[in-house]
Every structure is written in structure tokens, then in C-alpha cells.
């Protein structure tokens, strides 16, 4: 899909197994033709997407594309949810799908989970 | 063009274990999630679970949780799917199929591979 | 799970004829997105199926405009306006909404 529109890629119905303690950067890649969009996340509550206000976000440049990050540090079991990224431009609002983190809360390192395992986890909403 | 091309048949005993590839091509796969899909002799399509290979999540359906594994490597664009614990009713040919994560603009089927699981 | 329910499961139809198929859903496949994640299949035989329609009524690249896709909700529908001598196969609906992803069983269409 080739456009001058902003563009956010993050996949549909994308999911992350992260554990409770550790960083963790959740990426929102965004493609734009000249002046960068203000970007912003925010979590799902039921339908409604409350932004995140004070959390730690920063901007990676590459040659393609950017990625406006928000970063877990650590990351807390109550972060356990779905997320969604947008962008303003042109008094335009674009949303992204929303992509979804699973925290397992910390264990030793020979009983972490694997992706198998989370994705088989009977708490997962869907 | 998006291209699958999978690995040819299998014949395995019961109780033994079977691991089908699927290289894709036309297509970076960490934009993608990957599945597989069986279709036993004469019956209807039966999905068995998918990857995002970005990062290698995996989804399962519950018949095939614990005894499908599927795996990706993004350095040569193969998608991995191995059964465990084979029986004659898992006989079937097994498709990969890739789709377009972002606005599932494209849905691209392998060629099969027929598994055949016969004492 | 979701169950996806098809008919008929056979349909006669004579070459330049109208096909209908049915597909229902046990549960709205409406997803939060606003989005329907309903997609048709067409399988001959020997072949890997091959997607007809997706979200609903979309074609893919390539697809005949003779099929048509539509519905919301619980109810959807594959129409072929003229069969052509090459439209005989099988056709399967199937759900992208929920996890597991579910197919329909399958509505094979055969010349009368």
C-alpha cells in the first residue's frame, strides 16, 4: 500500500510473551513523506484507548522508516494488555491496530515460559 | 510475486514424529504471519495454528496444542511446522499459507506435502 | 470455538447459471477494529485452495468480477453471477476474527 499517508505497521492481532522485570521496548513503526506526525500511545480499557501520558517514549530513525518506542523499564505485571499507537496529520487521527503484551511476573530463569506455552495460557481475552 | 514452496512427502510410522518446511519468497516475512492448514484424504480444511515470524509467537488450535510446533527462520524465509506423536488419522496433506499482517492485502497457499502415517 | 456453518452442501448448477453459497456463523464476526474477517476459499481438485474474497467482499487480485461477496454479522454469502465451466470446485468460507481460525465445511459445486 504505497501512499504520501502516514503509516503505522504494527501487524493485526500481534502479540508479545515478556516477562515482569525486564526492559522492554514496544515499537510502533511509522512511515511518513515530510514532516514527522505526532505520535502517541495509549492502552485499551474495555473499547476505550486511555492515552499514556508520562511514560518514557523516544524516537529511532531509520533509512525507510521510523519507530516511536515506548519503553517498559522494567516492565511491571499490570502492563499485561493491548496497546495502540496514532498519529496526527492533517487534522487527521490514524490508529493502528492494536498489538497485545502478555507479562508473565518474574520466575527463574529455567521456569520462564515459553511462546508456546503463553499462547496456551486460558487468561488470554479474546 | 509471494511464492510458498514446500518440502515434498513423508511416510512415517506411528508414534513418530514429522517436520514439514515452507520457503517463501516475493516477501519479507517478519511483515507476514504464517499458518498451516491440513486436509485429510476426501474431508474439509482443519486449521492448525499460525506464527508472527517478527517474533515468533505462535497461536495453536487446542486439538494440536502440545504436539504442533511451529517455528520460523527469518534468515532464509522457511516456515517450520512438526507433529509429534503421529497416527494414521493425521494423514493429510499440510499446507503453509503466508498473509499480509497489515491489511491481509494478500493470502498465498503452498503447494501441499502429503504426510502418510502407516505401520 | 467459532462454528462455521455452510449450504447446501452440494449445488447443481448448468454453466451460465447464478450460484449461491451460505455461510453462517455461530458468533458476530465483527472484530474491534469495525472490521469483518470473513474469507472465501475455492479449491479444485488436486489444487491448494486458492482465496476468492476477503473481508467479506474484497477480491483478490486476479478474481473474476462474476463473484461477489456479502453479508455482515452472523450471515454471508458467495455469489457466482454466471458459472463458468471453470467454477466448478469446491468453496469454503472461513473466519479470521477469533482465534482458533475455523473453516466451513466445504460446498462443492457441480455441473447439473
Known amino acids: 500500500k504505497e501512499s504520501c499517508d502516514v503509516q503505522l505497521y504494527i501487524k493485526r492481532q500481534s502479540e508479545h510473551s515478556i516477562l515482569a522485570g525486564d526492559p522492554f521496548e514496544l515499537e510502533c513503526p511509522v512511515k511518513y513523506c515530510a514532516n514527522r506526525p505526532h505520535v502517541t500511545w495509549c492502552k485499551l480499557n474495555g473499547t476505550t484507548c486511555v492515552k499514556l501520558e508520562d511514560r518514557q517514549t523516544s524516537w529511532k530513525e531509520e533509512k525507510n522508516i521510523s519507530f516511536f518506542i515506548l519503553h517498559f523499564e522494567p516492565v511491571l505485571p499490570n502492563d499485561n494488555g493491548s496497546y495502540r499507537c496514532s498519529a496526527n496529520f492533517q487534522s487527521n487521527l490514524i490508529e493502528s491496530h492494536s498489538t497485545t503484551l502478555y507479562v508473565t511476573d518474574v520466575k527463574s530463569a529455567s521456569e520462564r515460559p515459553s511462546k508456546d506455552e503463553m499462547a496456551s495460557r486460558p487468561w488470554l481475552l479474546y | 510475486q509471494v511464492q510458498l514452496v514446500q518440502s515434498g512427502a513423508e511416510v512415517k510410522k506411528p508414534g513418530a514424529s514429522v517436520k514439514v518446511s515452507c520457503k517463501a519468497s516475493?516477501?519479507?516475512?517478519?511483515?507476514?504471519?504464517m499458518y498451516w492448514v491440513r486436509q485429510a484424504p476426501g474431508q474439509g480444511l482443519e486449521w492448525i495454528g499460525r506464527?508472527?515470524?517478527?517474533?515468533?509467537?505462535?497461536r495453536y488450535a487446542q486439538k494440536f496444542q502440545g504436539r504442533a510446533t511451529i517455528t520460523a527462520d527469518t534468515s532464509t524465509s522457511t516456515v517450520y511446522m512438526e507433529l509429534s506423536s503421529l497416527r494414521s488419522e493425521d494423514t493429510a496433506v499440510y499446507y503453509c499459507?503466508?498473509?499480509?499482517?497489515?491489511?491481509?492485502?494478500?493470502?498465498?497457499w503452498g503447494q501441499g506435502t502429503l504426510v502418510t502415517v502407516s505401520s | 470455538e467459532i462454528v462455521l456453518t455452510q449450504s447446501p452442501g452440494t449445488l447443481s448448477v448448468s454453466p451460465g447459471e447464478r450460484a449461491t453459497i451460505s455461510c453462517r456463523s455461530s458468533q458476530s464476526l465483527l472484530d474491534s477494529d469495525g472490521k469483518t474477517y470473513l474469507n472465501w476459499l475455492q479449491q479444485k481438485p488436486g489444487q491448494a485452495p486458492r482465496r476468492l474474497i476477503y473481508l467479506v467482499s474484497k477480491r483478490d487480485t486476479g478474481v473474476p468480477d462474476r463473484f461477489s461477496g456479502s453479508g455482515s454479522g452472523t450471515d454471508f454469502t458467495l455469489t457466482i453471477s454466471r458459472v463458468e465451466p471453470e467454477d466448478f470446485a469446491v468453496y469454503y468460507c472461513?473466519?479470521?476474527?477469533?482465534?482458533?481460525?475455523?473453516f466451513g465445511q466445504g460446498t462443492k459445486l457441480e455441473i447439473k
Open positions: 472461513w473466519q479470521g476474527t477469533l482465534f482458533p481460525r475455523t
Open positions: 506464527i508472527d515470524p517478527a517474533n515468533g509467537y505462535t
Open positions: 516475493g516477501v519479507n516475512i517478519k511483515d507476514t504471519y
Open positions: 499459507a503466508v498473509y499480509d499482517g497489515y491489511y491481509e492485502s494478500f493470502d498465498v
